[in-house]
């Protein structure tokens, strides 16, 4: 499942890139899942992807911001855990999560991605595979 791990890691890098341009994002409050319950990570992930993060269209950073946002919304390679979670109906709806401005939104997204990487690594039976 290296492809899944790479994709999650890439998303973190894209979030870090966007954090550099947080002042050029529309200061809108967006649903930002935090302390996501076990088995609802993919549901929370889709909430982050659905959020309307937008460039404020100011200055010359608009293109890189828009490309970054577009890349964040791309569907990652699916995993068994992800497929199982898609059938859960008990996870909170996106609207039920606390809304936060872009800076906190991105920080919480990064935290979730890190948690998902950690879970993915923990589910591996041995640690000597190719990184």
């Amino acid at each position: 499942q290296d492809r899944h791990m790479i994709r999650m890691r890439q998303l973190i890098d894209i979030v870090d890139q966007l954090k550099n341009y947080v002042n050029d994002l529309v200061p809108e409050f967006l649903p930002a899942p935090e302390d996501v319950e076990t088995n609802c990570e993919w549901s929370a992930f889709s909430c982050f992807q659905k959020a309307q993060l937008k460039s404020a269209n100011t200055g010359n950073n608009e293109r890189i911001i828009n490309v970054s946002i577009k890349k964040l919304k791309r569907k990652p390679p699916s995993t068994n855990a992800g497929r199982r979670q898609k059938h859960r109906l008990t996870c909170p709806s996106c609207d039920s999560y606390e809304k936060k401005p872009p800076k906190e939104f991105l920080e919480r997204f990064k935290s979730l991605l890190q948690k998902m990487i950690h879970q993915h690594l923990s589910s591996r039976t041995h640690g000597s595979e190719d990184s």
């Epitope: 492809r3 790479i6 890439q10 870090d16 970054s68 890349k71 990487i117």
Partner: antibody, heavy 117, light 106 residues
Framework: QVQLVQSGAEVKKPGASVKVSCKAS????????MHWVRQAPGQGLEWMGL????????IYNQKFKGRVTMTRDTSTSTVYMELSSLRSEDTAVYYC??????????WGQGTLVTVSS | DIQMTQSPSSLSASVGDRVTITCRAS??????LNWYQQKPGKAPKLLIY???RLHSGVPSRFSGSGSGTDFTLTISSLQPEDFATYYC????????FGGGTKVEIK
Amino acid sequence: QVQLVQSGAEVKKPGASVKVSCKASGYTFTDYWMHWVRQAPGQGLEWMGLIDTSESYTIYNQKFKGRVTMTRDTSTSTVYMELSSLRSEDTAVYYCARYGPLAMDYWGQGTLVTVSS
Amino acid sequence: DIQMTQSPSSLSASVGDRVTITCRASQDISNYLNWYQQKPGKAPKLLIYYTSRLHSGVPSRFSGSGSGTDFTLTISSLQPEDFATYYCQQFHTLRTFGGGTKVEIK
């Protein structure tokens, strides 16, 4: 097996630009992003940035922003790193390194760039 | 930016010695730390990723530990081929390397 082969050594004058290439083989080029790292003589490693090999999306170390440009050519499985407005402090060995799942898992052999008047 | 500080910057040891290198991050990086080995005139090679996981082909005498801000690379029994410079690298926020630790023959 995975191989990253870089272009040869370069000598440049201050103010000039240099373009280093890194040709990948042994894996699907567009499946892995690529990092660039440099090392000044007798010094440590410094991360310069990375490029998405499938879409040319780049993330640069703020220190090099405005001076570095990373590109790729999917037809030849090659990535390029161009550094402009060279100064003596840019004398270093420049490495490409594959973006593995959690680490730089394979490295090129390095390209020495000497900036001297 | 996250700063990475390695200590010592150099050390002398003999074959068979147990060697410990430490790396400290300027802020919490969880387990997002890698270790690389570099020999003179060569490119770095990945040894350990995500704090403690051995990259394929790396001998089991190498091990890594730590979490948060303090990390350790241990070589349980130094071999002739282990004399080299070792770098830690964080990947919590983009990438930063430590200054390196040169392991020399005593």
